[in-house]
């Protein structure tokens, strides 16, 4: 087989039809789409293309210039009257720049064989395109049969003599793709077998998915895959000041289009999305979480003087609980409850009040009751102690009333009703409460516990005792019940305003049982436990006073 090496054919004067063709063609040459990267565009090469034709009298370059006097590289061949044509045109080495699939766009004109007299037997209306991969930029000196055929190229529209007369040129555009490529570059070759062709432009390109920012993720320029149906998964990187839960990905199609986005980036706390970037929250604004769309004004009673704030600072005397969301207003403890009233029933007190005028901006207001027992003489108060019961409870009261039971009778109490809310414990300020002073009613006194024997004689017993621990009012009198032991049904009662008595008319050397109880305006208390004392025999002297255990 013939070698394709050597033999650059020098330009010659072009026939009229080529000139007409170029004028028309130039008007149709438009810029490439953004997803196409040119590896070669014969229209933009200013100097020598460096292509070679074999044989020398086959393809020839037509030296034309455009309106800016830039050269137009056009190759033509028109050996339609001669048999066995095998004219080759070889490009220079083309780098594939990492692309594994490339596209070849040819713009050409083709003469209609029917419009050529006498050439019907030898005239062809197609030409062939081949390629050869090579890592070597000087690898054109190869055999014909080492070239791989891409396709036979036919014209969609051929032109006739009539078209020439009307100055209408029919420019064909054909695109073919080649892949997968495995070497650094390649050569193209165009074989003419007897057609009348003008090759106006050759553009070799690959497709890419152009770099793009989607959902705050940057996806880089991505060369499409070798397979025409292949989708390449591409990872995006979040723009400055953005974060992601699910790494952003998109798929680059063979046509250079981004498809099927997965995941997204979000502006981090303190930043918001504006025009595809994450911009800082300005002072007075904050964003607590990446999942929030935009910066918001600080809530009431809070501020921030920082850029990129993720929360706002509470104003003086305002607070935020840890459990309060950063979007919630800062709040303060409530003011004191108002209009407290009391209702005393013996040793129970019912308190009622209305809520504070200022809840501090919170809904979680509750009440706490502090109980103090006060000495009316000394004016000193002390905690009430554990014996007092609160109904329903002492603290965390949601209702505006409470009942205290098991209080001491005839005792001065001060009840402090304090309003509290979720930030009361954060505030160093004074407690906010309303005080109510009450005195419990008198009640029956508690039992007498401490009885001492006095002078004991054969017919009498003298006793003394102390006031009950809890008189529960003013003691009006004592009632002393006594009887001879084992004669309980036959008892005697003495009343005394003092804490001493003498029982007369007793039998000598007999055991008597004594019980004492006190009375207030509220009634009698219960009798004391039984105390036993024995009168002296007839002949004995009276005994000394001593305390009965």
């Amino acid at each position: 087989p013939a070698s394709l090496a050597g033999c650059y054919s020098a330009p010659r004067r072009a026939p009229l039809w080529t000139c007409l063709l170029l004028c028309a063609a130039l008007r149709t040459l438009l810029a490439s789409p953004s997803n196409e990267v040119n590896l070669l565009d014969s229209r933009t090469v200013m100097g020598d293309l460096g292509w070679i034709a074999f044989p020398k009298n086959g393809w020839e370059e037509i030296g034309e210039v455009d309106e800016n006097y830039a050269p137009i590289h056009t190759y033509q061949v028109c050996k339609v009257m001669e048999q066995n044509q095998n004219n080759w045109l070889l490009t220079s080495w083309i780098s594939n720049e990492g692309a594994s699939r490339i596209f070849i766009e040819l713009k050409f004109t083709l003469r209609d064989c029917n419009s050529l007299p006498g050439g019907l037997g030898t005239c062809k209306e197609t030409f062939n395109m081949y390629y050869f991969e090579s890592d070597d930029q000087n690898g054109r000196n190869i055999k014909e049969n080492q070239y791989i055929k891409i396709d036979t190229i036919a014209a969609d529209e051929s032109f006739t003599e009539l078209d020439l007369g009307d100055r209408v040129m029919k420019l064909n555009t054909e695109v073919r793709d080649v892949g997968p490529l495995s070497k650094k570059g390649f050569y193209l070759a165009f074989q003419d077998v007897g057609a009348c062709i003008a090759l106006v432009s050759v553009r070799v390109y690959y497709k890419k998915c152009p770099s793009v920012v989607r959902h705050l993720a940057v996806f880089p320029d991505t060369i499409t895959g070798a397979d025409s149906s292949q989708l390449l998964e591409v990872s995006g990187s979040c723009v400055n000041h953005s974060v992601t839960d699910e790494p952003p990905k998109m798929h680059c199609s063979a046509e250079g289009e981004w498809l099927v986005p997965i995941g997204k980036c979000m502006c981090k706390a303190g930043y918001e999305e504006k025009n595809g970037t994450c911009q800082v929250c300005r002072p007075g604004f904050f964003k607590a979480s990446p999942h929030i769309q935009s910066c918001g004004k600080c809530p009431p009673h809070s501020y921030t003087h920082e850029e990129a704030s993720t929360s706002c600072v509470c104003e003086k005397d305002y607070f935020r609980r840890e459990s309060d969301p950063p979007t919630m207003a800062c709040t303060r403890p409530p003011s004191a409850p108002r209009n407290a009233i009391s209702n005393v029933n013996e040793t129970s007190v019912f308190l009622e009040w209305i809520p504070p005028a200022d809840t501090g901006g919170r809904k979680d207001v509750s009440y706490y009751i502090a109980c103090k027992k006060c000495n009316s003489h000394a004016g000193v108060c002390e905690e009430c102690g554990g014996h007092v019961r609160y109904l329903p409870r002492q603290s965390g009261l949601k209702n505006t009333s409470v009942m205290m039971v098991d209080l001491l009778a005839h005792t001065n109490y001060t009840f402090e009703i304090e309003a509290v809310n979720g930030v009361s414990d954060l505030s160093p300020g004074a407690r906010q409460y309303v005080s109510v002073n009450v005195t419990t009613n008198q009640a029956a006194p508690s039992p007498v516990t401490n009885v001492k024997k006095g002078k004991i004689a054969k017919n009498s017993i003298s006793l003394s005792w102390q006031e009950p621990d809890r008189p529960n009012g003013i003691i009006l009198e004592y009632e002393i019940k006594y009887f001879e032991k084992d004669q309980e049904t036959s008892y005697t009662i003495i009343k005394s305003k003092e804490t001493t008595i003498t029982a007369e008319g007793l039998k000598p050397a007999s055991v008597y049982v004594f019980q004492i109880r006190a009375r207030t305006a509220a009634g009698y208390g219960v009798f004391s436990r039984r105390f036993e004392f024995e009168t002296t025999p007839v002949f004995a002297a009276s005994s000394d006073q001593s305390q009965i255990p």
């Epitope: 300005r282 003087h305 920082e306 850029e307 600072v313 003086k316």
Partner: antibody, heavy 120, light 111 residues
Framework: EVQLVESGGGLVQPGGSLKLSCAAS????????IHWVRQAPGKGLEWVAY????????YYADTVKGRFTISRDNSKNTLYLQMNSLRAEDTAVYYC?????????????WGQGTLVTVSS | DIVMTQSPDSLAVSLGERATINCKAS??????????MNWYQQKPGKAPKLLIY???NLESGIPDRFSGSGSGTDFTLTISRLEPEDAASYYC?????????FGQGTKLEIK
């Protein structure tokens, strides 16, 4: 009671340096942005610089950018203005002023000012 | 930078009368529905005092005869009934973007 007290002013030659201080009390200094504002004799107010509570946000007027540095020490409740390459036109009373808490914030408390005179 | 221009440079108003001072910004000082415009009063030898923030909000402790209005680029400070202690210089200031520029000031005298 909120108080801001400037100090460090005085007479300095052109090209010289001076460091102003602003001592703060009566509020939680570390959460407040503070401004420096100056007033040339017989002239109006001119904003100079700003620093946020955590020193994360700092702004300067174009006239002082590259020459003045605003800083603060929250442990000492003190704001500073380091002034280098001083010029005659920097002669002014320098005030520190607290950024307010009511949005949108104004400068709600001001110091009494300290006079800086730049003259040969 | 945003340039703030006050008018008039000075004015004299009788006691009990209304005083109006205007301030025009070279570009809008509004952001997200708020006007970042403040007004200050300064008496000779004293530090300035904040009167109005956010174009129309009265600072606490300031008498209600002072009021502010406006949005975008045009703002007004009004003193409804002039008192002797209102004689002072008044400054507008924008805090929408740095640098936080002041107007040149308006000197108010009592007639």
């Amino acid at each position: 009671e909120v108080q801001l007290v400037e100090s460090g002013g005085g007479l300095v030659q052109p090209g010289g340096s001076l460091k102003l201080s602003c001592a703060a009390s009566g509020f939680t200094f570390s959460t407040f942005g503070i401004h420096w504002v100056r007033q040339a004799p017989g002239k109006g107010l001119e904003w100079v610089a700003y620093i946020s509570g955590a020193s994360t946000t700092i702004y300067y007027a174009d006239t002082v950018k590259g020459r003045f540095t605003i800083s603060r020490d929250n442990s000492k409740n003190t704001l500073y203005l380091q002034m280098n390459s001083l010029r005659a036109e920097d002669t002014a009373v320098y005030y520190c002023a607290r950024y307010g808490t009511s949005f949108p914030y104004g400068l709600d408390y001001w110091g009494q000012g300290t006079l800086v005179t730049v003259s040969s | 930078d945003i340039v703030m221009t006050q008018s008039p440079d000075s004015l004299a108003v009788s006691l009990g009368e209304r005083a109006t001072i205007n301030c025009k910004a070279s570009q809008s000082v509004d952001y997200d529905g708020d006007s970042y415009m403040n007004w200050y009063q300064q008496k000779p030898g004293k530090a300035p005092k904040l009167l109005i923030y956010g174009a129309s909000n009265l600072e606490s402790g300031i008498p209600d005869r002072f009021s502010g209005s406006g949005s975008g680029t045009d703002f007004t400070l009004t003193i409804s009934r002039l008192e002797p202690e209102d004689a002072a210089s008044y400054y507008c200031q924008q805090s929408n973007e740095d640098p936080f520029t002041f107007g040149q000031g308006t000197k108010l005298e009592i007639k």
